[in-house]
Interface confidence: low
């Protein structure tokens, strides 16, 4: 009895060659082998036949059905299909007649797989309203030229959307399959969804799932897309952009931006206004929600408002917001005295530093960077020549950095001179010798600056030189004589307010001794 070894199912990728095997079992010297095709009408046209005689196979091709490239039989009677096409998906019947051994027949089913092209998606480019109470068309997905027909699934933020195929107000999908001229299948799926506000940030895409030989599967994802949604305003924010301090102050002269944002889409129109005496002073109407105040002045302090002109908003939504613009300023400081204050020695005075500013400025007085006290009043009592110098009133706004001012005055103390004297290399009484050299130093201060003079110019007085803290010094270098010992030398400091004198004495002066 003749038996056939024919695989019941053969799978091949489109474009590849496939060989359908039909091998009789056992040894048969002479048999007839035929290949038939089962077409859609149920007819079985004969494709090829072969006669085995001994070890040689005589092949005859019958009806190639216009296939290109045509069917072929190889030397073992196997049916060869080069470049498999979708149209080759048929049942192929092999019949072997082996005389007395009988006749056998077997069928091979050929499945041809085609991977579809890249998945394409066409999103709805319009503006979709979340206020629609039924599903709206979201996008159409196309998977072209596959075999068998692919399946399409939809995804939101990477999560598969479980939508029915029946119309539904919450969402559904429709599908349509088309057989192309090539025999390949194309699938179009359209997604409909009822949209919500959180869909504004959602990422959507579709994927085509297709079959491959040996039960394997593939997936081709489309690019992702986002939707343009129309949703009403629910919240409005209105704030001072930059620059403003943590306490909410802006500096006079700064350019200030007031920023208003509603969370509706598309961006509604904003009306920016100032409230004065319960009247709206409309400053600007725009789509950005920005109001720029260039070189802001203290007169622009007050209540500013922003209104979102969104007619789709719910009745209970507060579409207006206001804020207080607080403009900080600091005017130049004014002193109760002029730039120079001239006072007599030992007198007293009070100097007032006036300031206008907002928020309330802090005042402090300094002299030579040394703090003298806080507040507007500077009290000067029993002034001395050490009180001479420059006094600074500093104003600052603690809550507004970089906004500060200073004003200063110079104090000149009027008085008769003070005198300080010194001897360089002084000697105790009785230790001076005739001809010893000595340098005398006389320092004075007062206002106006005192003149220094010496009672005897037998020596060489140096030019008076100004020193620190208003002192003027003069030095005189001379040789000690017995006449000096008798009379002494005086230094005198004088100015219009009086004079002071100091007499240098040398005691006993010994005569010069000759050296051995």
């Amino acid at each position: 009895e003749v038996r056939l070894s024919v695989p019941p199912l053969v799978e091949v990728m489109r474009g590849k060659s496939v060989i359908l095997d039909c091998t009789p079992t056992g040894t048969h010297d002479h048999y007839m082998l035929e290949w038939f095709l089962t077409d859609r009408s149920g007819a079985r046209p004969r494709l090829a036949s072969a006669e085995m005689q001994g070890s040689e196979l005589q092949v005859t091709m019958h009806d190639t059905r216009g296939r290109s490239p045509p069917y072929q039989l190889d030397s073992q009677g196997r049916l060869v299909l080069a470049e498999a096409q979708v149209g080759d998906e048929r049942d192929y019947v092999c019949v072997v007649r082996a005389g007395a051994a009988g006749t056998a027949e077997a069928t091979a089913r050929l499945n041809v797989f085609a991977k579809p092209e890249a998945t394409e998606v066409s999103p709805n480019k319009g503006t979709l309203s979340v206020m629609e109470d039924s599903a709206q068309e979201i996008a159409t997905c196309n998977s072209r030229n596959g075999n068998p027909a692919p399946k399409i699934t939809w995804y939101r933020n990477g999560q598969r959307l479980e939508v029915p195929v029946e119309m539904n107000p919450e969402g559904y999908m429709t599908s349509r399959t088309v057989r192309e001229a090539s025999g390949l299948l194309s699938l179009t799926s359209t997604l409909y969804l009822r949209l919500r506000k959180d869909d504004r940030d959602a990422s959507f895409h579709c994927a085509a799932h297709y079959s491959l030989p040996e039960g394997r599967h593939g997936r081709l994802d489309s690019p992702t897309f986002h939707l343009t949604l129309h949703y009403p305003t629910e919240h409005v924010q209105f704030w001072v952009g930059s620059p403003s301090t943590p306490a909410g102050w802006v500096r006079e002269g700064d350019t200030v931006q007031l920023l208003c944002r509603g969370d509706g889409s598309p961006s509604p129109e904003y009306t920016l206004f100032r409230l004065q005496d319960e009247q709206e002073e409309v400053l600007n109407v725009n789509l950005e929600g920005n109001l720029t105040l260039e070189g802001v002045t203290r007169g622009q302090s007050g209540t500013y408002g922003c209104r979102v002109e969104d007619y789709d908003a719910a009745d209970d939504v507060q579409l207006s917001k206001t804020l207080e613009l607080r403009v900080a300023y600091l005017d130049p400081l004014e002193l109760s005295e002029g730039k120079v204050l001239s006072l007599p020695l030992n007198s007293s005075a009070v100097v007032n530093c006036s300031v206008h500013g907002l928020p309330t400025p802090a005042l402090r007085w300094t002299k030579d960077s040394t703090p003298l006290g806080d507040g507007p009043m500077l009290s000067l009592s029993s002034i001395t020549f050490d009180s001479n110098g420059t006094y600074v009133c500093e104003a600052s706004l603690p809550t507004v950095p970089v906004l500060s001012r200073t004003q200063n005055f110079t104090l000149l103390v009027q008085g008769s001179p003070e005198l300080k004297t010194a001897e360089i290399e002084p000697k105790a009484d009785g230790s001076w010798r005739e001809g010893d050299e000595v340098t005398l130093i006389c320092s004075a201060r007062g206002h106006p600056d005192p003149k220094l003079s010496w009672s005897q110019l037998g020596g060489s007085p140096a030019e008076p030189i100004p020193g620190r803290q208003g002192w003027v010094s003069s030095s005189l270098t001379l040789k000690v004589t017995s006449a000096l010992s008798r009379d002494g030398i005086s230094c005198e400091a004088s100015n219009p307010h009086g004079n002071k004198r100091h007499v240098f004495h040398f005691g006993t002066v010994s005569p010069q001794t000759s050296q051995a």
Epitope: E280, E281, L283, N284, V285, N286, L291, T292, E294
Partner: nanobody, 125 residues
Framework: QVQLVESGGGLVQPGGSLRLSCAAS????????MSWVRQAPGKGPEWVSA????????SYADSVKGRFTISRDNAKNTLYLQMNSLKPEDTAVYYC??????????????????WGQGTQVTVSS
């Protein structure tokens, strides 16, 4: 700082035309309404015309309605006043002014905070 510089004034015969220009700098021109104001010799200032920030809305004093046209070019930061059918009573110094719109009830006012130096327009035969 805000600067407004007018030009285009001059001597013109009654029935003639002039076009005034105002070059603006020192502020965001496209964010503000603008006005033209004039002052005749020995008289107080008189508001002439205003235009909103985008240029889509204009208003005029009754005395110039139908003869004067206000316009602006935000790309060039420039305000214009086209004056046709000029009359001797239009003689004045014309000032361009940074402005805004105030609604009190149903009446719109056009207060100004900065004016230019002005350009003289003289209408005489």
């Amino acid at each position: 700082q805000v600067q407004l510089v007018e030009s285009g004034g001059g001597l013109v015969q009654p029935g003639g035309s002039l076009r005034l220009s105002c070059a603006a700098s020192g502020f965001t021109f496209s964010s503000y309404a603008m006005s033209w104001v004039r002052q005749a010799p020995g008289k107080g200032p008189e508001w002439v015309s205003a235009i909103n920030s985008g240029g889509g809305s204009t208003s005029y004093a009754d005395s110039v309605k139908g003869r004067f046209t206000i316009s602006r070019d935000n790309a060039k930061n420039t305000l214009y006043l086209q004056m046709n059918s000029l009359k001797p009573e239009d003689t004045a110094v014309y000032y361009c002014a940074k402005s805004w719109t105030v609604r009190i009830g149903q009446i719109y006012h056009h207060p100004t905070d900065y004016w230019g130096q002005g350009t003289q327009v003289t209408v005489s035969s």
